[in-house]
């Protein structure tokens, strides 16, 4: 978060930013930036694998929920969207695309139908769904 | 949008940002930044006047809907929240806190009950409600 001095190289002048204010990002153009994470909601319905590929093509991944505090904007998301959570049948656990295991108490997992993928819905709910079912999806990019 | 060179004054080094990426803001700390507007959703229920005062105290105003394209993140907002739209009984029009008139076709206006204030709900709907009814609210700050 850069809240001190910003160099506008075009005009070579300093822009003062109040210390209570800050820039967020960097994010892909026209993505949502919140607490230095980038999010985008995609309207077109794809299955989980196509959704994952779409996010990867944009240098991002499907939504990973890692913190109710840092991601409290997700509380108010309407509808159901693919996130990057998959079921590992061998050990019965749920894990994210990056291989990390779903932390307990982060999501309420609800079985919509038999499946190995999960949809995100408001108030930190995860709905189990068949991975080949088309749905809208959320991509996320964590800034460094 | 600053997507060229960013001066990190602390370390006095240039950080290269890909041209497809950009910073968003500046916004108050921990607000949502989207297309260079800042948004915050407040959980506590207040009447319209208290909600307006709360936003003003944060150098912001209640949500103003001015563009379906620039504010398409509002499509997916769950629940009902005060926005800065009020009914002017003298001429029957709906106007924003800044005095501008609601543009036609921006919001579908639905009467919940007799009232002079409006709640924002997903998919660009505005619900007419009594101004003294407590509700959650959305503050917005437009960046220059």
């Amino acid at each position: 978060i850069w809240s001190a001095v910003f160099l506008n190289s075009l005009f070579n002048q300093e822009v003062q930013i109040p210390l209570t204010e800050s820039y967020c990002g960097p994010c892909p153009k026209n993505w949502i930036c919140y607490k230095n994470n980038c999010y985008q909601f995609f309207d077109e319905s794809k299955n989980w694998y196509e959704s994952q590929a779409s996010c990867m093509s944009q240098n991002a991944s499907l939504l990973k929920v890692y913190s109710k505090e840092d991601q409290d904007l997700l509380k108010l998301v309407k509808s159901y969207h693919w996130m990057g959570l998959v079921h590992i049948p061998t050990n019965g656990s749920w894990q994210w695309e990056d291989g990390s295991i779903l932390s307990p108490n982060l999501l309420t997992i609800i079985e919509m139908q038999k499946g190995d993928c999960a949809l995100y819905a408001s108030s930190f709910k995860g709905y189990i769904e068949n991975c080949s079912t088309p749905n809208t999806y959320i991509c996320m990019q964590r800034t460094v | 949008i600053w997507s060229a060179v960013f001066l990190n004054s602390l370390f006095n080094q240039e950080v290269q940002i890909p041209l497809t990426e950009s910073y968003c803001g500046p916004c108050p700390k921990n607000w949502i930044c989207y297309k260079n507007n800042c948004y915050q959703f407040f959980d506590e229920s207040k009447n319209w006047y208290e909600s307006q005062a709360s936003c003003m105290s944060q150098n912001a105003s209640l949500l103003k809907v001015y563009s379906k394209e620039d504010q398409d993140l509002l499509k997916l907002v769950k629940s009902y929240h005060w926005m800065g739209l009020v009914h002017i009984p003298t001429n029957g029009s709906w106007q924003w806190e800044d005095g501008s008139i609601l543009s036609p076709n921006l919001l579908t206006i639905i009467e919940m009950q007799k009232g002079d204030c409006a709640l924002y709900a997903s998919s660009f709907k505005g619900y007419i409600e009594n101004c003294s009814t407590p509700n959650t609210y959305i503050c917005m700050q437009r960046t220059v």
Epitope: - | K78, Q113, K125
Partner: antibody
Framework: EVQLLESGGGLVQPGGSLRLSCTAS????????MSWVRQAPGKGLEWVSL????????YYADSVKGRFTNSRDDSRNTLYLQMNSLRAEDTAVYYC?????????????????WGQGTTVTVSS | DIQLTQSPSFLSAFVGDRVTITCRAS??????LAWYQQKPGKAPKLLVY???TLQSGVPSRFSGSGSGTEFTLTVSSLQPEDFATYYC??????????FGPGTKVDIK
């Protein structure tokens, strides 16, 4: 003028089917939830079913669940109640009503517009 | 399920009388209670919603009050056109509506 007009009532045998219609005018039909309420002869009001403004959610009284289907066609400003496996106890005047129930909202503002009712008689 | 009871089930009154009808819920229903008036052979008419808000066009002699489990509809000065049956209605369960059994108000 805000109006609701029901039709489709009549005499039907037990086990039979009937479809009621309710045509709306004078308000933005697609913006409101709609309910069906019935009243058996000489009895009080009984809520039957509600359909949300979008049509994506429908709710039913236990007494009709699995037998009645509430649907809407916003392009025709029309609400429907498909009634199957009818029983003698379904005999009633059926009213449709504009319902100020808003999904997920904390307050309920009642059924503010009612049709004149259509009579359904289930008898052999 | 939430049950509603109304008392009295029947009352006789003179024109000009102050009349109070009570509606009790079997459990708390916040302020989600409405009152309807129905005349013979006619559809019900919404009088009061959200416990105490008068529906547009309803005369001010009608008023509603209460909270939790006990609610009242009051007619401050009964008029000839007020002789009818009155029903309370709740929404608490999501969404399942219940009507009270009704109170018939007759001319004495």
């Amino acid at each position: 003028e805000v109006q609701l007009l029901e039709s489709g009532g009549g005499l039907v045998q037990p086990g039979g089917s009937l479809r009621l219609s309710c045509t709306a005018s004078g308000f933005t039909f697609s913006s409101y939830a709609m309910s069906w309420v019935r009243q058996a002869p000489g009895k009080g009001l009984e809520w039957v079913s509600l359909i949300s403004e979008s049509g994506s959610s429908t709710y039913y009284a236990d007494s009709v669940k699995g037998r009645f289907t509430n649907s809407r066609d916003d392009s025709r400003n029309t609400l429907y109640l498909q009634m199957n496996s009818l029983r003698a106890e379904d005999t009633a005047v059926y009213y449709c009503a504009k319902d100020r129930w808003f999904e997920g909202y904390h307050s309920y503002y009642g059924m503010d517009v009612w049709g004149q009712g259509t009579t359904v008689t289930v008898s052999s | 399920d939430i049950q509603l009871t109304q008392s009295p089930s029947f009352l006789s009154a003179f024109v000009g009388d102050r009349v109070t009808i009570t509606c009790r819920a079997s459990q708390g229903i916040s302020n989600n209670l409405a009152w309807y008036q129905q005349k013979p052979g006619k559809a019900p008419k919404l009088l009061v919603y959200a416990t105490s808000t008068l529906q547009s066009g309803v005369p001010s002699r009608f008023s509603g009050s209460g909270s939790g489990t006990e609610f009242t509809l009051t007619v401050s000065s009964l008029q000839p056109e007020d002789f009818a049956t009155y029903y309370c209605q709740q929404l608490k369960s999501y969404p399942s509506f219940t009507f009270g059994p009704g109170t018939k108000v007759d001319i004495k």
